[in-house]
Each structure stands twice: as structure tokens, then as C-alpha cells.
Interface confidence: low
């Protein structure tokens, strides 16, 4: 039975050209995390494997950094980075847990005037 829950940073916004940290946390389970996949829509951004460590997709290597922890740092943000991001926790024996984050990348002038999502 899957008892765990995924907490995420929820809906977040950031300025174009800036950086953002995507964070998920798995709680309420003693299952062992074997791997975490970070995906953007249908694209695999990065994998953190318990045995092999991090692997960043080569097409994102210039703009994606591993961590902190099992999170992911996106750098040099563009408006095209707006969208859904998923953290997919592969665990044993529970199975797969998925968390969702929505990122909106704003033009600097918009972001400065406080048009932001609230982080739950």
C-alpha cells in the first residue's frame, strides 16, 4: 500500500534570465528511493539514481544543475521554460510517486511588479 505523499514548491514564478530551484519532498513512507526523474512535459531533464548519481540530459546541461538535494536548479530562464515540471520518485517497495510544479517565467518588468503565484 502506498502511504507516502509528495510535497512540492507548487506554482512558482521567476524572472526571465534568472534561476529557480524545483523541489519535491517525499514523506510519510519508509520506502527506499531508488531514483528520481525530473521531467518537463514529455522531456526528461535529469535523473538522480541512488547508485549512479546524477545525469543531466545533454540538451539541458548548460542550464540545469543538480540539487540541492534531490531538487533541480534551472538557470538562464526563458519564457519557453514556462510549463509543468514533474518529479517522479521511484521507490521500493511502494512504486512510483509523482509531484507536479508549475513554473511561470515572467518578463523582468512584470515580475518586479509582483504578478506572482503564491507558493502554498
Amino acid at each position: 500500500m502506498m502511504t507516502g505523499t509528495i510535497e512540492t514548491t507548487g506554482n512558482i514564478s521567476a524572472e526571465k534570465g534568472g534561476s529557480i530551484i524545483l523541489q519535491c519532498h517525499l514523506s510519510s513512507t519508509t520506502a527506499q528511493v531508488t531514483q528520481v526523474n525530473w521531467e518537463q512535459q514529455d522531456q526528461l531533464l535529469a535523473i538522480c539514481n541512488a547508485d549512479l548519481g546524477w545525469h543531466i540530459s545533454p540538451s539541458f546541461k548548460d542550464r540545469v544543475a543538480p540539487g540541492p538535494g534531490l531538487g533541480l536548479t534551472l538557470q538562464s530562464l526563458t519564457v519557453n521554460d514556462t510549463g509543468e515540471y514533474f518529479c517522479i520518485y521511484h521507490t521500493y517497495p511502494d512504486g512510483t510517486y509523482t509531484g507536479r510544479i508549475f513554473l511561470e517565467v515572467l518578463e523582468s518588468s512584470v515580475a518586479e511588479h509582483g504578478a506572482r503565484f503564491q507558493i502554498p
Partner: nanobody, 117 residues
């Protein structure tokens, strides 16, 4: 000394197929991933596909559905099956691998693929 040796390149007609191989030797640790990049004349080197030691694969949008990457971990060898080749696939194809995460540690010398009628 670590070496990556590519083979399988050549001349093929549009719509044809080729299979590239990359044999890695000299590793103390098996590479955590192996992959393929390519460089067309007058263009920058671009990533094509990667395969992790655990079997996960992913591809550049330009080759999705046409190219398939695979690996034989016991032989430290990666393969790139290229189908439905187009003239724009003409390039020198380089094998690459990584032992520690974060950097592309090793490169092959490249193998030329020419797609032309």
C-alpha cells in the same frame, strides 16, 4: 588509457539505414552513460542521443523515432541504429561517455556518415 572507437559510418542513400558502434576500453569503472553527438560541416557539435547504464534512453528531437540508441554493458559498447536517414543527417558522429556525473569525460575520434543519392 581510455579509448572510444567508433565504427559503422559510411555512405548511404536517403531513406537508408546504418548502425554505428562505439567500443569503450580502458575504463576502471564502467561509464555511467554513453552517447552520440554529431558535427555537420560548418556547424557546431550537437547532441544526438544518450543511454544510461540502467538502460534509460533519450534523444534529440531531430532524430526521435528514427534513431535508436542501445548499449551492451558487459562489453562497454554503445550502438546507434539510424533509420530513415536524411541528407541533413550527414555529419561526423562522435561517441562520448561519462564516468563521474557532470562532465563528458571521453570522446571518440568520430566516424563520417554521408547521406546522399
Amino acid at each position: 588509457e581510455v579509448q572510444l572507437v567508433e565504427s559503422g559510418g559510411g555512405l548511404v542513400q536517403p531513406g537508408g539505414s546504418l548502425r554505428l558502434s562505439c567500443a569503450a576500453s580502458g575504463f576502471t569503472l564502467s561509464p555511467s552513460w554513453m552517447g552520440w553527438f554529431r558535427q555537420a560541416p560548418g556547424k557546431e557539435r550537437e547532441w544526438v542521443a544518450s543511454v544510461l547504464r540502467g538502460g534509460y534512453t533519450w534523444y534529440a528531437d531531430s532524430v526521435k523515432g528514427r534513431f535508436t540508441i542501445s548499449a551492451d554493458n558487459s562489453k562497454n559498447t554503445a550502438y546507434l541504429q539510424m533509420n530513415s536517414l536524411k541528407p541533413e543527417d550527414t555529419a561526423v558522429y562522435y561517441c562520448a561517455s561519462e564516468v563521474a556525473s557532470g562532465e563528458t569525460d571521453y570522446w571518440g575520434q568520430g566516424t563520417l556518415v554521408t547521406v546522399s543519392s
